[in-house]
């Protein structure tokens, strides 16, 4: 396993609709055709997998139909969008990139993007 540098923004604020987007960029030293991108969430020293996609260089990422993630790829950049976020989902979201095939296998893990999610205030009832 060979190491690879992965860069991602330090902080992102989710929209009022619970959507957060960030770019995950990797310095590809190899000529991989198959790349796997995984988003991990770290909170309270617990790490869980949020979503993952395997894609062919030059093609679109395809997450599972029930995934909360969508994304596009351009060269060595992956534009990730996470939907359906709520305040309780605030945490550090780590981008993990693997150059799967052909060999050699490269693995890169970013420092993480702190995503802040603020639940919208409910609209007050109005009397007419």
């Amino acid at each position: 396993c060979k190491a690879m540098h992965v860069a991602q923004p330090a902080v992102v604020l989710a929209s009022s609709r619970g959507i957060a987007s960030f770019v995950c960029e990797y310095a590809s030293p190899g000529k991989a055709t198959e790349v796997r991108v995984t988003v991990l969430r770290q909170a309270d020293s617990q790490v869980t997998e949020v979503c993952a996609a395997t894609y062919m260089m030059g093609n679109e990422l395809t997450f599972l139909d029930d995934s909360i993630c969508t994304g596009t790829s351009s060269g060595n950049q992956v534009n990730l969008t996470i939907q359906g976020l709520r305040a309780m989902d605030t945490g550090l979201y780590i981008c993990k990139v693997e150059l799967m095939y052909p060999p050699p296998y490269y693995l890169g893990i970013g420092n993480g993007t702190q995503i802040y999610v603020i639940d919208p205030e409910p609209c007050p009832d109005s009397d007419f």
Partner: antibody
Framework: EVQLVESGGGLVQPGGSLRLSCAAS????????MHWVRQAPGKGLEWVSY????????YYADSVKGRFTISRDNSKNTLYLQMNSLRAEDTAVYYC??????????????????WGQGTLVTVSS | DIQMTQSPSSLSASVGDRVTITCQAS??????LNWYQQKPGKAPKLLIY???NLETGVPSRFSGSGSGTDFTFTISSLQPEDIATYYC?????????FGQGTKVEIK
């Protein structure tokens, strides 16, 4: 027993089409990277194409790009090679082969460890 | 594309002889090189993977070495059943490419 069995070869006219099948037994094709390799009569081995375990990634030799399509049907545990616009120089024995590395394996060891018996494709008028 | 140059293209040796085949890659492929044996009318068989690792069930008289661009395949004591064509293959850049083959015959 781990086995690959090709079928679908035969005689076809230039410009015609054929679909080769490679049925796997003893293992699941979706767990491996799969390849097609061909060998023209009396010549050496030529790598043709590959497909990833997920099926999301494919690659082709320049000599067949745009004419050949690799695919798999996981429910049938079968690999395919759709060959269109065939030319005389496509005449060869076509082998399917399994890359020994499991798709999700931590042990990154490679090599075509299982091959089919081959199917002959003859392109001639 | 990475070119794989194998030599010699053919050789004739006596039973018990040490046989050496070389394979040169046009660029660095680290140790991502495999060696295959193909007997007439049969599919190729993997003998050596990652330049020097012997595939399970393959006799120990077969060995491989090398890294980067220069590789060697050796049969320490040639046996009658070793009559075949041997191919090297790089396994790190698409398209995967094979050497042109070395046909081994018995004198």
């Amino acid at each position: 027993e781990v086995q690959l069995v090709e079928s679908g070869g035969g005689l076809v006219q230039p410009g015609g089409s054929l679909r080769l099948s490679c049925a796997a037994s003893g293992f699941t094709v979706s767990s491996y990277y799969m390849h097609w390799v061909r060998q023209a009569p009396g010549k050496g081995l030529e790598w043709v194409s590959y497909i990833s375990g997920s099926g999301s990634s494919t690659y082709y030799a320049d000599s067949v790009k745009g004419r050949f399509t690799i695919s798999r049907d996981n429910s049938k545990n079968t690999l395919y090679l759709q060959m269109n616009s065939l030319r005389a120089e496509d005449t060869a024995v076509y082998y399917c082969a399994r890359d020994r590395m499991l798709v999700d394996s931590v042990n990154r060891v490679f090599g075509f460890d299982v091959w089919g018996q081959g199917t002959l494709v003859t392109v001639s008028s | 594309d990475i070119q794989m140059t194998q030599s010699p293209s053919s050789l004739s040796a006596s039973v018990g002889d040490r046989v050496t085949i070389t394979c040169q890659a046009s660029q660095d492929i680290s140790n991502y090189l495999n060696w295959y044996q193909q007997k007439p009318g049969k599919a190729p068989k993997l003998l050596i993977y990652d330049a020097s690792n012997l595939e399970t069930g393959v006799p120990s008289r077969f060995s491989g070495s090398g890294s980067g661009t220069d590789f060697t395949f050796t049969i320490s004591s040639l046996q009658p059943e070793d009559i075949a064509t041997y191919y090297c293959q790089q396994h790190t850049n698409f398209p995967f490419t094979f050497g042109q083959g070395t046909k081994v015959e018995i004198k």
